[in-house]
């Protein structure tokens, strides 16, 4: 299964295109953007009505080695007097990236792209009621 | 670059670290997760800090389409209903990373390009109390 | 303790100019953002002109683009909105606020996550 015609435009393959082995693809892992500055956030984490903490994963064996992934602190949400109200539910907010994977086969070496889902932080959310008959 | 372990019976030769360059497989893994958020929940309608998604699409890129989130409003939605502007809606933004096709309109060249994308939204507590 | 004190508001013919000041005080504009937001009867509030000190980035609604300017001087811990070409649709009650939304990407506006409000100033537009 290879990557669709990207938003189904039907690409003029330019003659500087570098030659690419059937079944793969080329790809340059030095990241454009990569020194984008990123400001300290303001603590949204622990301000949030549904608060979260962050846990670092990290896999010699994927670019980038570290994914941070976040986990709501709670089921319900925090209300004004600071106490959790379980009437409404802190859920996970999640996004997808690219990772490369690389993987050894005996003294080979192979690269795979792979989908990781991240989750981002959470949100404070009404829940659905499901009214038995 | 990042050290890779490797079995101790191999030749010295292999680099230990990522290359700049690699040849990757064209399957991508798990690639048919659901990209669509507005399919995949409705929390950005029943949130108390709702979004609107808004499609960015980019044919250099992939994934092409990419759902960008806006809070709704500058307070959040109260148990009647109603904005409070005690409170406020904050957007959640990740960095993630994607291809882009380099050189452009090549069909199977890229880089890997890191973004950063507004996910949806969460209430926050404003760190100093509003004037009365 | 933090005061944000809006002034400048009034009556004036679709067409006309206004010029809004908010002082603040216990508060300075270093590292921080400032703006300007109007919520009309009935309607939500809604954000019309921020700026952040940090790296001077400027937002301005859609609707207020070209007419409205948003300043500040620094020395008197004051920002302005200049309004022109006032348009019946801009009659609303007016507010200044601040807060560190300078956390967030220029494309994002620095209009979020505002700490401090002052009580608001009518402006009201008559066609």
């Known amino acids: 299964r290879k990557i669709p015609k990207v938003g189904h435009t039907f690409f003029q393959k330019p003659e500087s295109c570098p030659p690419v082995p059937g079944g793969s693809m080329k790809l340059d892992i030095g990241i454009i953007n990569e020194n984008q500055r990123v400001s300290m956030s303001r603590n949204i984490e622990s301000r949030s009505t549904s608060p979260w903490n962050y846990t670092v994963t990290w896999d010699p064996n994927r670019y980038p080695s570290e994914v941070v992934q976040a986990q709501c602190r709670n089921l319900g949400c925090i209300n004004a007097q600071g106490k959790e109200d379980i009437s409404m539910n802190s859920v996970p907010i999640q996004q997808e990236t690219l990772v490369v994977r690389r993987k050894h086969q005996g003294c080979s070496v192979s690269f795979q792209l792979e989908k990781v889902l991240v989750t981002v932080g959470c949100t404070c959310v009404t829940p659905v009621i499901h009214h038995v008959q | 670059g990042i050290t890779i372990p490797r079995n101790p019976g191999c030749p010295n030769s292999e680099d230990k670290n990522f290359p700049r360059t690699v040849m990757v497989n064209l399957n991508i893994h798990n690639r048919n997760t659901n990209t669509n958020p507005k399919r995949s929940s409705d929390y950005y309608n029943r949130s108390t800090s709702p979004w609107n998604l808004h499609r960015n699409e980019d044919p250099e890129r992939y994934p092409s389409v990419i759902w960008e989130a806006k809070c709704r409003h500058l307070g959040c939605i109260n148990a009647d209903g109603n904005v409070d502007y005690h409170m406020n809606s904050v957007p959640i933004q990740q960095e993630i990373l994607v291809l882009r096709r380099e050189p452009p309109h090549c069909p199977n060249s890229f880089r890997l390009e890191k973004i950063l994308v507004s996910v949806g939204c969460t209430c926050v507590t404003p760190i100093v109390h509003h004037v009365a | 303790e933090v005061q944000l004190v809006e002034s400048g508001g009034g009556l004036v013919q679709a067409g006309g100019s206004l010029r809004l000041s908010c002082a603040a005080s216990?508060?300075?504009?270093?590292?921080?953002?400032i703006g300007w937001f109007r919520q009309a009867p009935g309607k939500e509030r809604e954000a019309v002109s921020c700026?952040?000190?940090?790296?001077?980035?400027?937002y301005y609604a859609d609707s207020v683009k070209g007419r409205f300017t948003i300043s500040s001087d620094n020395a008197k811990n004051t920002v302005y909105l200049q309004m022109n070409s006032l348009k019946p649709e801009d009659t609303a009650v007016y507010y200044c606020?601040?807060?560190?939304?300078?956390?967030?990407?220029?494309?994002?506006?620095?209009?979020?996550?505002?700490?401090?409000w002052g009580k608001g100033t009518q402006v009201t537009v008559s066609s």
């Open positions: 606020a601040g807060g560190g939304g300078s956390y967030y990407y220029t494309q994002l506006n620095y209009c979020y996550d505002m700490d401090y």
């Open positions: 216990g508060f300075t504009f270093d590292d921080y953002a």
């Open positions: 700026f952040s000190s940090s790296d001077g980035s400027i």
